[in-house]
């Protein structure tokens, strides 16, 4: 009876989930009901006495195939070369931190932190980003000056839409400048780096939205938002890139208890965006110009735009008052890069299709870890590589471009049987000379099979050993690109392979 009831519940719950999808219920509600369905199915499995274990990766995670890894490494290479070009050092930190280290740093996002089950010792959490661990590292080592990059996985208990390149385990590529410097110079460099990387990756047209936490706070103050509601109203404003002003206003008034007239005043500001002229216009604003914080923020943005013009990237930057990045630790300039979808109608503005990089100034974060509250000014950026991987992968799929998943330069093959020893000797010579080489793991492989593997793997060269060639002291070298085949003296083979693959002299 129990089993029949469970089966009926699984059927009913399945129908319930389908109904919710048809009604276009909220993603969270659907997710919750799907989770319930899976729990019911799991109980059915246990009831059978042998639970059907479904082989899959945990929710919000994925494996990377060799093809995907090849894409990923190319993306990382572009990013790392840029970071190094700007003089950054590299660090690494543990994947988990003391829970206390992460507590109180992320505002409303704190609920997304993964806590590890207490093993009777320290209370631990998986890192949520690379910025808070960096601040902890600075405070712990009493560092006041560093320019560093850090590429590593972070963890968020989000309800991700994996199709849009969002995950629970994902890479972040961070670049940060810590230290007391003249205003806006490091900030401008961060924006320059962001633009360099996004341009190099050739993933499409992008725009970097810029704002300042002080302008936001000043704006909220002059609009009449109570201090206690600043952060929560911030998170509502930040949704303006995804939903209409009406929906944001309804959330502010209906859910967050803001007076409608206060919300309207906010609306007058946050729907504005432009360049340095908007900064100047707001400096003349009768209300904002009376707010010390807002004036400081606007003054810094004016200076920032001067540097951005010198860096030649001002055309990529937009001052956007609706940008209100949701992390509690930002104190000054904040920025976010979005990919632009070109307008379908002439005269329309380009449409933002999701954040691909972001960052800002966080002058107070290190002080949170310092016993004396000593501050280390910091500014940084984070590249949203998972989104970028998705875009690059989609583009490659659409173009049907072949992606090489190995760096093998030459396949060592044999034309006749009983030449395994010769192949092993030759491949070893090549490895010792720093050449990337492979052979098939068969004693007597058919030449056709070897050549087929060579072509499919996209290996540029094949070195073919034959009995006659052995007697003559030569190796046949065939190129996949030109299809030409030449006899190369054995002692010249390494040099010839290097020449053909443009590889500098190197040994392992």
């Amino acid at each position: 009876a129990d089993r029949a009831a469970l089966e009926e519940l699984v059927r009913l719950q399945g129908a319930h989930v389908r109904g919710l999808k048809e009604q276009k219920a909220s993603a969270e509600q659907i997710e919750e009901e799907v989770t319930k369905l899976l729990k019911l199915k799991a109980q059915l499995g246990q009831d059978e006495g042998k639970q059907k274990f479904v082989l899959k990766t945990p929710k919000g995670t994925r494996d990377y195939s060799p093809r995907q890894m090849a894409v990923r490494e190319k993306v990382f290479d572009v990013i790392i070369r840029c970071f190094k070009r700007h003089g950054a050092e590299v660090i690494d930190t543990p994947v988990f931190e003391l829970k206390e280290t992460l507590t109180g740093k992320y505002g409303e996002d704190s609920k997304l932190i993964y806590d590890l089950k207490d093993q009777g010792g320290e209370l631990l959490s998986l890192r949520y980003d690379l910025t808070v661990p960096f601040a902890r590292y600075l405070a712990m080592n009493k560092l006041t000056n560093i320019k560093r990059y850090h590429i590593a996985k972070v963890y968020r208990r989000d309800n991700p839409a994996m199709t849009r390149g969002r995950y629970r385990e994902f890479y972040q590529c961070d670049f940060d400048i810590a230290g007391q410097f003249d205003p806006m110079i490091p900030d401008a460099e961060c924006l320059k780096i962001m633009c360099e990387i996004l341009s190099s990756l050739q993933i499409g047209n992008f725009l970097v939205k810029v704002n300042d936490r002080r302008i936001l706070d000043g704006m909220f103050a002059v609009c009449g938002v109570p201090d206690s509601k600043f952060r929560t109203i911030c998170s509502s404003v930040d949704k303006l890139d995804k939903v209409s002003w009406e929906e944001v206003k309804n959330e502010m008034v209906g859910e967050k208890g803001l007076a409608p007239e206060v919300a309207d005043r906010i609306g007058d500001y946050v729907q504005q965006h432009g360049g340095v002229s908007l900064v100047e216009q707001l400096l003349q604003d009768p209300k904002l110009s009376q707010n010390k914080q807002a004036v400081e923020g606007l003054g810094d943005l004016k200076l920032l735009f001067e540097y951005l013009i010198l860096f030649g990237i001002d055309d990529k930057i937009s001052f956007d008052l609706s940008l209100a990045r949701g992390l509690d630790y930002y104190t000054g300039v904040i920025y976010e890069a979005v990919l632009l979808q070109m307008p379908t109608q002439a005269g329309e503005e380009p449409l933002g299709v999701g954040s691909i990089a972001a960052g800002g100034r966080y002058d107070g974060l290190v002080g949170m870890f310092d016993p004396k509250g000593r501050k280390v000014p910091c500014v940084g950026l984070s590249i949203g590589v998972e989104r970028i991987f998705s875009i690059v992968e989609q583009r490659l799929e659409a173009s049907e471009e072949k992606v090489r998943t190995t760096e093998t330069q030459v396949l060592v093959a044999s034309a006749q049987k009983k030449l395994l020893e010769e192949r092993l000797k030759l491949v070893s010579e090549l490895w010792d000379a720093g050449i990337k080489a492979e052979l098939l793991y068969k004693k007597n492989p058919k030449l056709l099979n070897q050549l087929q593997y060579w072509e499919e793997a996209g290996i540029p060269l094949v070195a073919i050993i034959g009995e006659q060639e052995l007697r003559d002291g030569v190796i046949k070298l065939r190129s996949v690109a030109s299809r030409e085949e030449v006899d190369v003296r054995r002692e010249d083979l390494v040099e010839e392979i290097r020449r053909r693959t443009n590889q500098p002299l190197s040994t392992c």
Epitope: A5, L9, L12, H16, E32, K36, L40, Q43
Partner: antibody, heavy 120, light 107 residues
Framework: QVQLVESGGGLVKPGGSLRLSCAAS????????MSWIRQAPGKGLEWVSY????????NYTDSVRGRFTISRDNAKNSLYLQMNSLRAEDTAVYYC?????????????WGQGTLVTVSS | DIQMTQSPSSVSASVGDRVTITCRAS??????LAWFQQKPGKAPKLLIY???NLESGVPSRFSGSGSGTDFTLTISSLQPEDFATYYC?????????FGQGTKLEIK
């Protein structure tokens, strides 16, 4: 056998706060959605709030949203209801209840209830 | 919110009688309906879930039927211990709501 024992009820003035607790035993607490259901004296039943097995999902009836907070500690096999800004209409017996088949919103096991009286 | 309406609000019957209580939902709830029995000073006790499934340990004289918006609880032959208040509850969508109750009294 399944046992749910509520505590923390009592007399409180309007605007005051109380924290109800529910100690669970006899089943794998961390597998089950849990809920608080109340019953005003001489009245019907009202489903106040629920929380999922790992606290990912919570929900509240409109009359308590923003004032009450449901939470759980799976390590301690305990369910909690933090009640703030209490009103006279919150006076009721509060029952802690376990979901049927872990996730079905039907209470198959109930505690004995704890009385909350809000009065000046 | 889904409203649940029970009828009658009270019923008098004798031991051995067949009793039917009905419950109507303000909108379709498929089979997401449960029935509870409550005695004075006690917590409710689950009798029926998903409209017709008998909770283990509940006597077979209790049965449930219906789907969509109309549901019934039937006690085929009343026993002395069955005199109590009966509630229906929808488990289709939050807030999960109960009927106002049907008091079953001895005639």
């Amino acid at each position: 056998q399944v046992q749910l024992v509520e505590s923390g009820g009592g007399l409180v003035k309007p605007g005051g706060s109380l924290r109800l607790s529910c100690a669970a035993s006899g089943f794998t607490f961390s597998d089950y959605y849990m809920s608080w259901i109340r019953q005003a004296p001489g009245k019907g039943l009202e489903w106040v709030s629920y929380i999922s097995d790992s606290s990912t999902y919570t929900n509240y009836t409109d009359s308590v949203r923003g004032r009450f907070t449901i939470s759980r500690d799976n390590a301690k096999n305990s369910l909690y209801l933090q009640m703030n800004s209490l009103r006279a209409e919150d006076t009721a017996v509060y029952y802690c209840a376990r979901y049927l088949y872990q996730v079905i919103a039907v209470a198959d096991s109930w505690g004995q209830g704890t009385l909350v009286t809000v009065s000046s | 919110d889904i409203q649940m309406t029970q009828s009658p609000s009270s019923v008098s019957a004798s031991v051995g009688d067949r009793v039917t209580i009905t419950c109507r939902a303000s909108q379709g709830i498929s089979s997401w309906l449960a029935w509870f029995q409550q005695k004075p000073g006690k917590a409710p006790k689950l009798l029926i879930y998903v409209a017709s499934n008998l909770e283990s340990g509940v006597p077979s004289r209790f049965s449930g039927s219906g789907s969509g918006t109309d549901f019934t609880l039937t006690i085929s032959s009343l026993q002395p211990e069955d005199f109590a208040t009966y509630y229906c509850q929808q488990a289709n969508s939050f807030p999960y709501t109960f009927g106002q109750g049907t008091k079953l009294e001895i005639k």
